[in-house]
């Protein structure tokens, strides 16, 4: 989703880890939303 950043070596070295971090963050957000929804 960031084509220009692909020229940066950092992108190559961290791509998988950043994707994992993003997935984990989305999972945590979804869980927080579920807790809020359940409490309503």
């Amino acid at each position: 989703d960031n084509p220009s950043l692909s020229i940066d070596l950092t992108f190559h070295l961290l791509r998988t880890l950043l994707e994992l971090a993003r997935t984990q963050s989305q999972r945590e957000r979804a869980e927080q939303n579920r807790i809020i929804f359940d409490s309503v």
């Epitope: 989703d1 960031n2 220009s4 950043l5 020229i7 940066d8 070596l9 950092t10 992108f11 190559h12 070295l13 961290l14 880890l17 950043l18 971090a21 993003r22």
Partner: antibody
Framework: EVQLQQSGPELVKPGASVKMSCKAS????????MKWVKQSHGESLEWIGV????????FYNQKFKGKATLTVDKSSSTAFMQLNSLTSEDSAVYSC???????????WGQGTLVAVSA | DVLMTQTPLSLPVSLGDQASISCRSG???????????LEWYLQRPGQSPRLLIY???NRFSGVPDRFSGSGSGTDFTLKISRVGAEDLGIYYC?????????FGGGTKLEVK
């Protein structure tokens, strides 16, 4: 010419927070990740974390999770780092750095000195 | 974390001499892509670090050819032929193959 201009020195009290800046020029800010490095007095270098200026994705060195918070302002091509709950252990020079397609720390800011003292 | 150990801690040289700095990693720093992300930096007194060598042996733009890097796996060397006054300072090796990225403790190159 790639330039990373950092904010000035900070003298702060234990327990306080500090926010420093790193203004980028000479290249397209969103083309490269921004990294932050700590150098304690007379000591080696420690990588703190890295931020993607496009979407704010951050990856921290586990050691600095909870201590450092990285952000960017795309409109001013500026990266920020906030350090919280400061102790004497946080007294150091903090530098921002940018890589290239070949290396991770090709260009460096001049560093921001943070002194934590009561 | 990958420990990067540099030797010697201090290296006194006469200007014009050759200098050699060693860097050893606690484990192989060959990345899963086959590359070895070993870099060398020089920090002159009162200045920010400056990139000299990337991927073990490649000189960064503007770096004189008297600087050369070599090594593989866990053992790496930076050589400076004909040391000049502008080469004095602290040299750091760095690995970017494993997270967290780590720097060596530094080698101070000084005049004998």
């Amino acid at each position: 010419e790639v330039q990373l201009q950092q904010s000035g020195p900070e003298l702060v009290k234990p327990g306080a927070s500090v926010k420093m800046s790193c203004k980028a020029s000479g290249y397209t800010f969103t083309d490269y990740f921004m990294k932050w490095v700590k150098q304690s007095h007379g000591e080696s270098l420690e990588w703190i974390g890295v931020i993607n200026p496009n979407n704010g994705d951050i990856f921290y060195n586990q050691k600095f999770k909870g201590k450092a918070t990285l952000t960017v302002d795309k409109s001013s091509s500026t990266a920020f780092m906030q350090l919280n709950s400061l102790t004497s252990e946080d007294s150091a020079v903090y530098s921002c750095a940018r890589g290239t397609d070949r290396a991770l720390f090709a260009y460096w800011g001049q560093g921001t000195l943070v002194a934590v003292s009561a | 974390d990958v420990l990067m150990t540099q030797t010697p801690l201090s290296l006194p040289v006469s200007l014009g001499d050759q200098a050699s700095i060693s860097c050893r990693s606690g484990q192989s720093i060959v990345h899963s892509d086959g590359n070895t992300y070993l870099e060398w930096y020089l920090q002159r007194p009162g200045q920010s670090p400056r990139l000299l060598i990337y991927k073990v042996s490649n000189r960064f733009s503007g770096v004189p050819d008297r600087f050369s890097g070599s090594g593989s796996g866990t053992d790496f060397t930076l050589k400076i032929s004909r040391v000049g006054a502008e080469d004095l300072g602290i040299y750091y090796c760095f690995q970017g193959s494993h997270i967290p990225w780590t720097f060596g403790g530094g080698t101070k190159l000084e005049v004998k």
